[in-house]
């Protein structure tokens, strides 16, 4: 039986009955937060085969092996993952081994075993025969491998039962327990799955089968299941269905996603039945099963009950995301808050039409409006007292509205109004009125021309670029010194420079008044000679990437009516030059006959340039004679330590530190320092770890039901 | 297309049993229950039962647990009811309707319905 | 069981003329997920019931829109706006939110 649409079994281990019909879960598994230590042995469910999404083992003690719970398990499908995760076994106190002795393929996605105090027979695991790709598997802060003295079948008497392959240089035995190997298909089977008699099963089976070369005796499907039978695609009038089977239209027309309003349920697109519409795609009316591309944005309409929403916070804006249409009307009030641009930018930067008016006040923290980016109509049906549609008071850091020369917006109806923006030009209202079509509505004092701009740059001169020079991390440019009416009045010159991978930045992009900015910024003291051309020496940079740079000066200067004067350069577009690529990723090679190997990579994370093409080097190697030659039997050579508290990188201090050739010097001598390049790689596990943590604890701890 | 074909009339004795069958065309038969409901001349519709095709794991309404056994045959597409010890009060049209089988939400409706099996029950 | 009581029994009406069928179940058919499952099916004379309404309000496909369904809890409505000749039979709600499944009695809509 198909059960789902994901089972959560948690404080109770009774629950697990649940489990009792399962062939396959479509969906995920979590079995988590059973504190009570329980007996498990007669919990068995040699029914369930396929999970289509991820497990999730956290906090359930007193479990040893899964293989007992679990021993048919064959296929983790990965359709939708954990953190990118498939199988997470993290915090399991009592797990012994891992043990599903039947895991043959996890179809997308990485591993995730961490903090399992007592967990042994890791090392004796060869992921690479489960996983397309090994390098993102994190198996951290278990049992260390020499406490484990993991021992595969028959090792001890000297009659090993399982295959060897080859991890990390090391060829070895690989098994999952004490008494059941890591299942391996011959080598002629190449990337099909194989029967327990090591038959090849049909090309379409994933996993195992139960007879070889027939699509109706697969345990998992490599592609879809449709009516008893493994299929490549599926066919003609069927869709697949949650990345593993195939199903008809009334099916689909039959179900609805957990999230859906009543009337709307799955939709038919792509030859897919999914719960909605991908992005970019809408439902071709309210009824319908089938997806239309938007034009633009797909529309959105929000309504707020009490005509106006109030916007004082990320919180507040987050009710906004995806809406494009909003009836009614925006009260902002953003005091203060942290990377306030990008998040409101987040959340309200679709909103196209506001039905009412918009009012912004006391905004300390905004520089621009730019987050609305695609605000283009305010209707002004409703209108605040004395007929404003667009109202913004006292708003100590406002610079700027919009970019006027890439943005069309219409108010139809009612005035607007200007009051105490200090930094607010009035040459950038009066281009709003313009713009919007409404210059002649306002009466004289809606736009305030003394309290508004008092404190801004406001008439702005043009400093030029003279030059540029580039390398794979560096940018050299100078501009023309600019020469203000007073010479003493010119402080100093600020440089702003960010990647820019398309030419459509603004100076306020991300940049709010508490700090935020996606700007870097670097101050240029004046040159001691005054014909010499100011510059900058910008490094650090990526290879072949493009940045844009914009410079201010910074002065002191007045001019008419106490408005300061100032000068900044257009945005400059400049691309490093290319370098290196970085190592190409995952590389695997397998041998399909005797006088051929297949080579399979991934590109590098670092292009650095354009890639044109790769260059395979291959050379025979000599026959490793060396083998593995432990002997377990004396005991005396595994080292007995402490128990493993399942924490990380708790470093031992011993009384008699190893000797280690340090520094070209042979002789005892303290472990060498880490390099800044380690210390950086450890400070990011440790940030990557807690974001995890985080994450796992945010996704399951959930308020009890009513 | 989708249909769900019923076997044709049965006159049966009282006291005997009869099995009536409903073979679906046109869709993946293990995807949907199969459900049973009952109409007495002139009478309204009962609910009698509904069976999952893939496991054999069945629902039935107490009034009819000792009257009706459901089965299924997924070889041929192909649900039976056996109806048993029978009455007058058992005369009556038997339809079959496939409601989806779907563990998470659904519209829950017979979308299908079977051409419907007369049985009469006379001495 | 739920017991689902339909009203009227027969409701005559004239072509074009609007009809309102009622049906109450004895106890709320809300399910702890918030859905209900109250359907409207039509059984014309000599054939199988045919789905028309499903979850209260929502019209099945190809089901003309001068059908429509409201109600929640235990009270729930059937409108016809316009009748015409090809709506003539019984009409069912059913619930199947609660095992057993039931149906309501029936109201025949007829010719005046």
């Known amino acids: 039986e198909i059960c789902g649409p994901g089972i959560d079994i948690r404080n109770d281990y009774q629950q697990l009955k649940r489990l009792e019909n399962c062939t396959v879960i479509e969906g995920y598994l979590h079995i988590l937060l059973i504190s009570k230590a329980e007996d498990y042995r007669s919990y068995r469910f040699p029914k369930l085969t396929v999970i289509t999404e991820y497990l999730l083992l956290f906090r359930v003690a007193g479990l040893e092996s899964l293989g007992d719970l679990f021993p048919n398990l064959t296929v983790i499908r990965g359709w939708k993952l954990f953190y990118n995760y498939a199988l997470v076994i993290f915090e399991m106190t009592n797990l012994k081994d891992i043990g599903l002795y039947n895991l043959r393929n996890i179809t997308r996605g990485a591993i995730r075993i961490e903090k399992n105090a007592d967990l042994c027979y890791l090392s004796t695991v060869d992921w690479s025969l489960i996983l397309d790709a090994v390098s993102n598997n994190y198996i951290v802060g278990n049992k260390p491998p020499k406490e484990c003295g993991d021992l595969c079948p028959g090792t001890m008497e000297e009659k090993p039962m399982c295959e060897k392959t080859t991890i990390n240089n090391e060829y070895n035995y690989r098994c999952w327990t004490t008494n059941r190997c890591q299942k391996m298909c011959p080598s002629t089977c190449g990337k099909r799955a194989c029967t327990e008699n090591n038959e090849c099963c049909h090309p379409e089976c994933l996993g195992s089968c139960s007879a070889p070369d027939n699509d109706t005796a697969c345990v998992a499907c490599r592609h879809y299941y449709y009516a008893g039978v493994c299929v490549p695609a599926c066919p003609p009038n069927t869709y697949r269905f949650e990345g593993w089977r195939c199903v008809d239209r009334d099916f689909c027309a039959n179900i609805l996603s957990a999230e859906s309003s009543d009337s709307e349920g799955f939709v038919i697109h792509d030859g897919e039945c999914m719960q909605e519409c991908p992005s970019g795609f809408i439902r071709n009316g309210s009824q319908s099963m089938y997806c239309i591309p938007c034009e633009g944005p797909c529309p959105k309409v929000c309504e707020e009950e009490k005509k106006t929403k109030t916007i004082d916070s990320v919180t507040s804006a987050q009710m906004l995301q995806g809406c494009t249409i909003f009836k009614g009307n925006l009260l902002i009030n953003i005091r203060r808050g942290n990377n306030i641009a990008s998040e409101l930018e987040n959340f309200m930067g679709l909103i196209e039409v506001v039905t009412g008016y918009v009012k912004i006040r006391h905004s300390h923290a905004l520089v621009s409006l730019s987050f609305l980016k695609n605000l283009r109509l305010i209707l002004g049906e409703e209108q605040l007292e004395g007929n404003y549609s667009f109202y913004v008071l006292d708003n100590q850091n406002l610079q700027q509205l919009w970019d006027w020369d890439h943005r069309n917006l219409t108010i139809k109806a009612g005035k607007m109004y200007f009051a105490f923006n200090p930094k607010l030009c009035v040459s950038e209202i009066y281009r709003m009125e313009e713009v919007t079509g409404t210059k002649g509505r306002q009466s004289k004092g809606d736009i305030n021309t003394r309290n508004n701009g008092e404190r801004a740059s406001c008439e702005s001169d043009v400093l030029h670029f003279t030059s540029t020079t580039t390398s794979k991390n560096r940018i050299i440019i100078t501009w023309h010194r600019y020469r203000p009416p007073d010479y003493r009045d010119l402080i100093s010159f600020t440089v702003y420079y960010k990647e820019a991978p398309f030419k459509n930045v603004t100076e306020y992009d991300g940049q709010d008044a508490c700090g935020s900015n996606s700007w870097n910024m670097v101050d240029v003291d004046l040159p001691p000679n005054k014909d010499v051309e100011p510059g900058i020496l910008l490094h650090g940079l990526k290879p072949w990437t493009q940045y844009a740079v914009y410079v201010k000066a910074v002065t002191l200067t007045m001019v008419e009516n106490d408005h300061i004067r100032g000068a900044k350069s257009e945005i400059l577009y400049i691309r490093t030059n290319a370098s290196v690529p970085s190592i190409p990723l995952d590389v695997l090679s397998a041998s399909n006959s005797s006088s051929q190997l297949i080579v399979k990579w991934n590109p590098p994370s670092l292009p650095n340039g354009n890639l044109s093409y790769y260059i395979v080097r291959w050379q025979r190697q000599p026959q490793d004679g060396y083998l593995y030659r432990h002997n377990y039997c004396s005991k005396d050579k595994i080292p007995i330590r402490k128990y493993a508290d399942g924490t990380i990188d708790i470093e031992e201090v011993t009384e008699n530190p190893k000797t280690e050739v340090c520094g070209g010097e042979k002789g005892p001598c303290c472990a060498c320092p880490k390099t800044e390049a380690e210390k950086q790689a450890e400070k990011e596990e440790a940030e990557y770890r807690k974001v995890f943590e985080n994450f796992l604890h945010n996704s399951i701890f959930v308020p009890r039901p009513e | 297309e989708v249909q769900l074909q019923q076997s044709g009339p049965e006159l049966v004795k009282p006291g005997a049993s009869v099995r009536i069958s409903c073979k679906a065309s046109g869709y993946a038969f293990t995807d949907y229950y199969m459900n049973w409901v009952k109409q007495s001349h002139g009478k309204s519709l009962e609910w009698v039962a509904n069976?999952?095709?893939?496991?054999?794991?069945?629902n039935y309404n107490q009034k009819f647990k000792d009257k009706a056994t459901l089965t299924v045959d997924k070889s041929s597409n192909t649900a039976y009811m056996e109806l048993r010890s029978l009455t007058s009060e058992d005369t009556a049209v038997y339809y079959c309707a496939r409601w989806i089988l779907y563990y998470g939400r659904s519209k829950w409706y017979f979308d299908v319905w079977g051409t419907g099996t007369t049985v009469t029950v006379s001495s | 069981d739920v017991l689902m009581t339909q009203t009227p029994l027969s409701l005559p009406v004239s072509l074009g003329d609007h009809a309102s069928i009622s049906c109450r179940s004895s106890q709320s058919i809300v399910q702890s997920n918030g859905d209900t499952y109250l359907e409207w099916y039509l059984q014309k004379p000599g054939q199988s019931p045919k789905l028309l309404i499903y979850r209260i309000s929502n019209r099945f496909s190809g089901v003309p829109d001068r059908f429509s369904g409201s109600g929640s809890g235990t009270d729930f409505t059937l409108k016809i706006s316009r009748v015409e000749a090809e709506d003539l039979g019984v009409y069912y709600c059913?619930?199947?939110?609660?095992?057993?499944?039931?149906f309501g009695g029936g109201t025949k809509l007829e010719i005046k």
């Open positions: 059913f619930q199947g939110s609660h095992v057993p499944y039931t």
């Open positions: 069976i999952n095709p893939n496991n054999g794991g069945t």
